[in-house]
């Protein structure tokens, strides 16, 4: 038997993946648990095996179809259950009526590349991955640049309040190594959150021309 409080949080990547984390205060020794997804309007249902990510939390990804296939709509509700094996039976440990487009977390942006670099500025572009057709242009981005001697946490956030998959970084120092990250968020959804940060893109500004002030 399991006692204690539990928390069951899931996000939809807007296409064909629901990622879930289940936290449980009480001890769970050698218990097999899974998440079961049952949509109210669709013909499929799906399960994934919960795997430990810490002493009291488990995670899994419900793969609903091919990565770019649109498996849910803005009108769908998915009943999500945490089921744990108790002897020969499955016990429902947590349940929620999940509205996918109210609980969005997109995939991190991909394909970051330097379009053009100068001594003091750098133009960078990226692409969004597995984003639904529903969003049209209703996305926003945050970006950050890692300067030498600083941490990511210290980097100021640059906000792009529209679907703009490029940025021109200004007032950079010549001949300096930088790293850049970006993340994306749909404007839709009460519980929607930012995507993970992209993989960092390393770039170096051009050296200042000899004999010129910088």
């Amino acid at each position: 038997a399991v006692n204690g409080t539990s928390q069951f949080t899931c996000f939809y990547n807007s296409r064909a993946n629901i990622s879930c984390v289940w936290s449980q205060d009480g001890a769970l020794q050698d218990t097999s648990c899974q998440v079961h997804a049952w949509p109210d309007r669709r013909r499929w249902n799906q399960t994934c095996e919960l795997l430990p990510v810490s002493q009291a939390s488990w995670a899994c990804n419900l793969i609903l179809g091919a990565p770019d296939s649109q498996k849910l709509t803005t009108v769908d509700i998915v009943t999500l259950r945490v089921l744990c094996r108790e002897g020969v039976r499955w016990r429902v440990m947590a349940i929620q009526d999940f509205k996918p487009f109210e609980n969005l977390r997109l995939m991190a942006p991909i394909s970051l590349q330097v379009v053009h670099v100068e001594t003091h500025r750098c133009n960078i572009s990226w692409e969004i991955s597995q984003a639904s057709h529903y969003f049209e242009r209703h996305l926003e981005f945050e970006a950050r640049t890692l300067s030498p001697g600083h941490t990511w946490e210290e980097a100021p956030l640059l906000t792009l309040k529209q679907k703009q998959e490029w940025i021109c970084l200004e007032t950079l120092t010549p001949d300096t190594q930088y790293e850049f990250q970006v993340r994306v968020k749909p404007l839709q959804g009460e519980f929607t959150t930012w995507s993970p940060w992209s993989q960092p893109l390393a770039f170096r500004t051009k050296p200042a021309a000899l004999g010129k002030d910088t």
Epitope: D40, R41, R42, R43, S69, Q70, T73, T74, V75, I77, D97, S132, H133
Partner: antibody, heavy 116, light 107 residues
């Protein structure tokens, strides 16, 4: 087997209301949306709204401007569609259907005639 | 609302023919497109769901394809019982909407 059986034909005067029933059998009534679709003579099918019997949640086509009300009686596995302030252009066959990735089972239809 | 437009509106064909009906949505509906067959005085019957899924009991001569805004229903070899009116329907968003229908007649 899954069956949806609708109430019989109705003749109504303009301004009146009509309530059509749809009795479901052969599946768990509370687990699937019931939708209502109508078809005026020679016209395309027109979605009116739907209801999830397990929760009572409803969605309506704004075209009907609050004239349509969809309800269920789960104890009788029956859905209802009421259309008020009837006008002649509401003369149509009204269908209920179960939604499961498309409308996979349909009632036989109920002809509603609005005439003075 | 999403407008659904079918073409042609009517079509004459013979038993054994291969027939294609197209459906165009006024905006991207991904794969949330269903096809129905209706005969006079009867309720529609679901043929294809989610663009290409064959509903149970529907003969394999019916197939669907497409994505985004353009979709097709194909009947590979017409049978006498296939002469009817066919409708496409989007369930991408409320209000769900139907095409105007394609009447398939015997040549």
């Amino acid at each position: 087997q899954v069956q949806l059986v609708q109430s019989g034909a109705e003749v109504k005067k303009p301004g009146a209301s009509v309530k059509v029933s749809c009795k479901a059998s052969g599946y768990t009534f509370t687990s699937h949306w019931i939708t209502w679709v109508r078809q005026a003579p020679g016209q395309r099918l027109e979605w009116m709204g739907d209801i999830y019997p397990g929760s009572g949640n409803t969605n309506y086509n704004e075209k009907f401007q609050g004239r349509v009300t969809i309800t269920v009686d789960t104890s009788a596995s029956t859905a209802y569609m009421e259309l008020s302030s009837l006008r002649s252009e509401d003369t149509a066959v009204y269908y209920c259907a179960r939604e499961r990735g498309g409308f996979d089972y349909w009632g036989q239809g109920t002809l509603v005639t609005v005439s003075s | 609302d999403i407008q659904m437009t079918q073409s042609p509106s009517s079509l004459s064909a013979s038993v054994g023919d291969r027939v294609t009906i197209t459906c165009r949505a006024s905006q991207d509906i991904s794969n949330f497109l269903n096809w129905y067959q209706q005969k006079p005085g009867k309720a529609p019957k679901l043929l294809i769901y989610y663009t290409s899924g064959l509903h149970s009991g529907v003969p394999s001569r019916f197939s669907g394809s497409g994505s985004g805004t353009d979709f097709t229903l194909t009947i590979s070899s017409l049978q006498p019982e296939d002469f009817a009116t066919y409708y496409c329907q989007q369930d991408n968003n409320h209000p769900y909407t139907f095409g105007q229908g394609t009447k398939l007649e015997i040549k």
